[in-house]
Amino acid sequence: QGGAAEGVQIQIIYFNLETVQVTWNASKYSRTNLTFHYRFNGDEAYDQCTNYLLQEGHTSGCLLDAEQRDDILYFSIRNGTHPVFTASRWMVYYLKPSSPKHVRFSWHQDAVTVTCSDLSYGDLLYEVQYRSPFDTEWQSKQENTCNVTIEGLDAEKCYSFWVRVKAMEDVYGPDTYPSDWSEVTCWQRGEIRDACAETPTPPKPKLSK
């Protein structure tokens, strides 16, 4: 979506199918208030942005309300009346789902089921990442709904978990953004902990009878 266009770089993010953010970086026009003109339908007249983002006192982007719009965004970034960059982009290619809400953990011996509120639209993956201080890397599991069961956990270990939502590439294309991660939560023996020790605690010695 970026790429130099007369020195203009563009980024588009469609936040949770609610708000579109288009930002530009135009070195040639760094001290200029470029204007953003847009339409959601090829037949309409262009509207001008009413909610600009500013950087160092100059326009650098636009926020648009676009609730659940399965539309193409036709836009023109202009210096006065001169179009600096004109393009059309299908907005959901740049979807960024919202971070998971109401994350809950349900433990049963060596397994945990992580649930959260499903988003109102589909073709998403809900990813849970987890690790203990003994793990060098995060482990990951994902499902089509926010109901992810992870088995084979060690009840004695402390595990950190976080959850995010991703758009399916075969539906939304390769340029979407994953959601922000949920807050990290730490669990040991089915109980929530403030944190997991950075260095693994040595196993307790077995007491001889």
């Epitope: 090829g42 600096v84 960059f85 004109t86 059309s88 290619y93 294309g173 390769p174 340029d175």
Partner: antibody, heavy 118, light 106 residues
Framework: QVQLQESGPGLVKPSGTLSLTCAVS?????????WSWVRQPPGKGLEWIGE???????NNNPSLKSRVTISVDQSKSQFSLKLSSVTAADTAVYYC???????????WGQGTLVTVSS | DIQMTQTPSTLSASVGDRVTITCRGS??????LGWYRHKPRKAPNLLIY???SLKSGVPSRFSGSGSGTEFTLTITSLQPDDFATYYC????????FGQGTKVDIK
């Protein structure tokens, strides 16, 4: 391997409506791709007509827009072109193609010649 | 509308020649440009997408470059199968093809 196959009448009368259908096989029409129509009049170059997403959103050539209708039928895995008020200038080989996201038209039908004549 | 102008419109060359075709946009299109080879009575064949990315399965003698308004298709060593008409296509804003460059035998 995605395959596309155009079908429809090879002869249309002036002022009538040209109707073509493109059957998609070997891949899901419900994907991140757009489904396109392109034509080539005899002895001329390629002309982009328009495209559709499986949800029904369309993006059409502004110079043809008022005459073009593109629709999709997910259940039949096909999409269609209707071009109204045709004249001899609409005589062309019509191609359907898949517009892979940001990657151009990567799969094409073999093309079908439509002649506008009384 | 964005117009795409290809040069030259016709090019005579021999097998083994290095061939360069240029495409110029009336407005900046970033790198949203494809190149196609089109042979008579066949469907066009995508060679290059996003200005410089080679489509999988396309021979490495084809390469593309450019950004903004100026783009180039290069064939390093022309093969018998390469005598055809070549088109550029912008898909940055709606879509438009160049008028084509016919590569024929010298």
């Amino acid at each position: 391997q995605v395959q596309l196959q155009e079908s429809g009448p090879g002869l249309v009368k002036p002022s009538g409506t040209l109707s073509l259908t493109c059957a998609v096989s070997g891949g899901s029409i419900r994907s991140s791709n757009w489904w396109s129509w392109v034509r080539q009049p005899p002895g001329k170059g390629l002309e982009w007509i328009g495209e559709i997403y499986h949800g029904g959103t369309t993006n059409n050539n502004p110079s043809l827009k008022s005459r073009v209708t593109i629709s999709v039928d997910q259940s039949k895995s096909q999409f269609s072109l209707k071009l109204s008020s045709v004249t001899a200038a609409d005589t062309a080989v019509y191609y359907c193609a898949r517009h892979r996201y940001s990657s151009g038209l990567d799969y094409w039908g073999q093309g079908t010649l439509v002649t506008v004549s009384s | 509308d964005i117009q795409m102008t290809q040069t030259p419109s016709t090019l005579s060359a021999s097998v083994g020649d290095r061939v360069t075709i240029t495409c110029r946009g009336s407005h900046s299109i970033s790198n949203w440009l494809g190149w196609y080879r089109h042979k008579p009575r066949k469907a066009p064949n995508l060679l290059i997408y996003k200005a410089s990315s080679l489509k999988s399965g396309v021979p490495s003698r084809f390469s593309g470059s450019g950004s903004g308004t100026e783009f180039t298709l290069t064939i390093t060593s022309l093969q018998p199968d390469d005598f055809a008409t070549y088109y550029c296509q912008q898909y940055n804003h709606y879509s438009t093809f160049g008028q084509g460059t016919k590569v024929d035998i010298k």
